[in-house]
């Protein structure tokens, strides 16, 4: 989902660092959305 | 051709927080992450951070988590290094750069002198 | 943190004679892509640092090709063929291969 900065070499050595990152996010979203849906 | 564009030097007290910018233009800003290094006196040369210009994502060298902070406005192509808690070893130029596809810092910035003094 | 040592920290050159700078990293460099993302940098006085070599012994665009490097693993060298008075300044190693990136202390070129 990020195509054009995939050009960059930085993209590449931090690729798996990235993926990392965006999982955490997804998760601590994922956490939030539940935390809300349970107190409703 | 590439063209990074510091902010002008700037004396700040201890305890004080100071923001550089770094003007883009050569090239589609989004496209390349942008790196900043800082350089003591007389010392060498330290990486501090990089930032996804596109998705805003931020690896910062350990060293300095918790007082850097970085960020980018897309619409002027300029990013932004932001140190807080400054201590007088904080005095060093700062640079900004961008890599290519082959290599991590192919172009610098004309870096911005910080002196931390009482 | 990888720890990139530089050696000497001074070296005197004769202007046109040939000059070798070490670098050693404390483990190897070499990327899990295989690759071995290690650049030189060139630092003038009073200027900004500029790209010489990038992946060990690749000339970037512009520079001149009396500037060669080489090595492996954990030992790489910058060579200067035939110094010349604009050569003359700090020049950096950097790996690039694991985070945190870092740079080696810096050599000093000056005339002899």
């Known amino acids: 989902d990020n195509p054009s900065l995939s050009i960059d070499l930085t993209f590449h050595l931090l690729r798996t660092l990235l993926e990392l990152a965006r999982t955490q996010s997804q998760r601590e979203r994922a956490e939030q959305n539940r935390i809300i849906f349970d107190s409703v | 051709q590439v063209q990074l564009v510091q902010s002008g030097a700037e004396v700040k007290k201890p305890g004080a927080s100071v923001k550089v910018s770094c003007k883009a233009s050569g090239y589609t800003f989004t496209d390349y992450f942008m790196k900043w290094v800082r350089q003591a006196p007389g010392q060498g040369l330290e990486w501090m951070g990089v930032i996804n210009p596109n998705q805003g994502d931020i690896f910062y060298n350990q060293k300095f988590k918790g007082r850097v902070t970085m960020t980018v406005d897309k619409s002027i192509s300029t990013a932004y290094m932001e140190l807080s808690r400054l201590r007088s070893d904080d005095t060093a130029v700062y640079y900004c750069a961008r890599g290519t596809d082959r290599a991590l810092f192919a172009y610098w910035g004309q870096g911005t002198l910080v002196t931390v003094s009482s | 943190d990888v720890v990139m040592t530089q050696s000497p920290l001074s070296l005197p050159v004769t202007l046109g004679q040939p000059a070798s700078i070490s670098c050693r990293s404390g483990q190897s460099i070499v990327h899990s892509d295989g690759n071995t993302y290690l650049e030189w940098y060139q630092q003038r006085p009073g200027q900004s640092p500029r790209l010489l070599i990038y992946?060990?012994?690749n000339r970037f665009s512009g520079v001149p090709d009396r500037f060669s490097g080489s090595g492996s693993g954990t030992d790489f060298t910058l060579k200067i063929s035939r110094v010349e008075a604009e050569d003359l300044g700090v020049y950096y190693c950097f790996q690039g291969s694991h985070i945190p990136w870092t740079f080696g202390g810096g050599t000093k070129v000056e005339i002899k």
């Open positions: 992946k060990v012994s």
